[in-house]
């Protein structure tokens, strides 16, 4: 039984060219985190594994960079780079949990950060 | 370098049990997931079965789920795959792959044929 | 199950040709989708993962492209050592799925 929930930064704002931390956490529940797959709509951003560390995919190493914890640092935002972002934690033994963030990338210079929310 | 060799294939009766073994070398075997992958004479590839790095969890595929168990041992960089109850579909190429992320497999061995015929 | 569906099973092309092999999946996998070369008695070898990164010491030439269901493989400039049957291959989710092949023979 899947009792785990993850907690992420929720809807987020940043300013065009600067840069934002996308972090998730998974609570409630013993369950190993054995993989933590960072996407953006359809595409795979990072890959943080247990064992092997952090992959980035190659389109992205300019801008994304591992870290902290768990979470993904993007840099030199643009307006292309608004849109969802997800989460998804492999777990042993319970499976997997997806978490989901919306970031949007302000040519303005006013970016609030939103209320933190959680996914069960 | 990385090299996976697998071996213990052979000819075997419909009904009888075979198990493959595939020796790693070059990297840290028990930091990557593997697969078992298999090919029949003339056709494509089919996925058999994969297992984690500390053996904690396995999938298979529905064709040989209850008759295949995919194993490892870590401290003999080894990975295994019991085959009980073969039938004559099941003639085929294994090849042993590993799993960097489970996203893609991106070192194969060079196969050992199973032909399960009477 | 994901049903990866490639086309075309066969092509006939001339070295120095543009190629491209296309691979529909059944259900949206994201880019979790690799591109596989296989030559006569040989092992698999890995191309492209996560639908566009080229693996290590594959040549330029090739390139991966698409997500959700829809990904093609372009070989810019086909060369003979190219002349093999190409695969797709999914990760999303497990059972994993092949594509049924793409054969290029020479013209």
């Known amino acids: 039984m899947m009792t785990g929930t993850i907690e992420t930064t929720g809807n987020i704002s940043a300013e065009k060219g600067g840069s934002i931390i996308l972090q998730c956490h998974l609570s409630s529940t013993t369950a190993q985190v054995t993989q933590v797959n960072w996407e953006q709509q359809d595409q795979l951003l990072a890959i943080c594994n247990a064992d092997l560390g952090w992959h980035i995919s190659p389109s992205f190493k300019d801008r994304v960079a591992p870290g902290p914890g768990l979470g993904l640092t993007l840099q030199s935002l643009t307006v292309n780079d608004t849109g969802e972002y997800f989460c998804i934690y492999h777990t042993y033994p319970d499976g997997t949990y997806t978490g989901r963030i919306f970031l949007e990338v302000l040519e303005s210079s006013v970016a609030e950060h939103g209320a933190r929310f959680q996914i069960p | 370098e990385v090299q996976l060799l697998e071996s213990g294939g052979g000819l075997v009766q419909p009904g009888g049990s075979l198990r493959l073994s595939c020796a790693a070398s070059g990297f840290t075997f028990s930091s990557y997931s593997m697969n078992w992958v298999r090919q029949a004479p003339g056709k494509g590839l089919e996925w058999v079965a994969n297992i984690k790095s500390s053996g904690s969890s396995t999938s298979y595929a529905d064709s040989v789920k209850g008759r295949f168990t995919i194993s490892r041992d870590n401290s003999k960089n080894t990975l295994y795959l019991q085959m009980n109850s073969l039938r004559a579909e099941d003639t085929a190429v294994y090849y042993c792959a590993r799993g960097p992320y489970d996203v893609w497999m991106d070192y194969w061995g060079q196969g050992t044929l199973v032909t399960v015929s009477s | 199950d994901i049903q990866m569906t490639q086309s075309p099973s066969s092509l006939s092309a001339s070295v120095g040709d543009r190629v491209t092999i296309t691979c529909r999946a059944s259900?949206?996998?994201?880019?979790?989708l690799n591109w596989y070369q296989q030559k006569p008695g040989k092992a698999p070898k890995l191309l492209i993962y996560a639908a566009s990164s080229l693996q290590s010491g594959v040549p330029s030439r090739f390139s991966g492209s698409g997500s959700g269901t829809d990904f093609t493989l372009t070989i810019s400039s086909l060369q003979p050592e190219d002349f093999a049957t190409y695969y797709c291959?999914?990760?999303?989710?497990?059972?994993?799925?092949f594509g049924g092949g793409t054969k290029v023979e020479i013209k």
């Open positions: 291959q999914q990760s999303y989710s497990t059972p994993l799925t």
């Open positions: 259900q949206s996998i994201s880019s979790y």
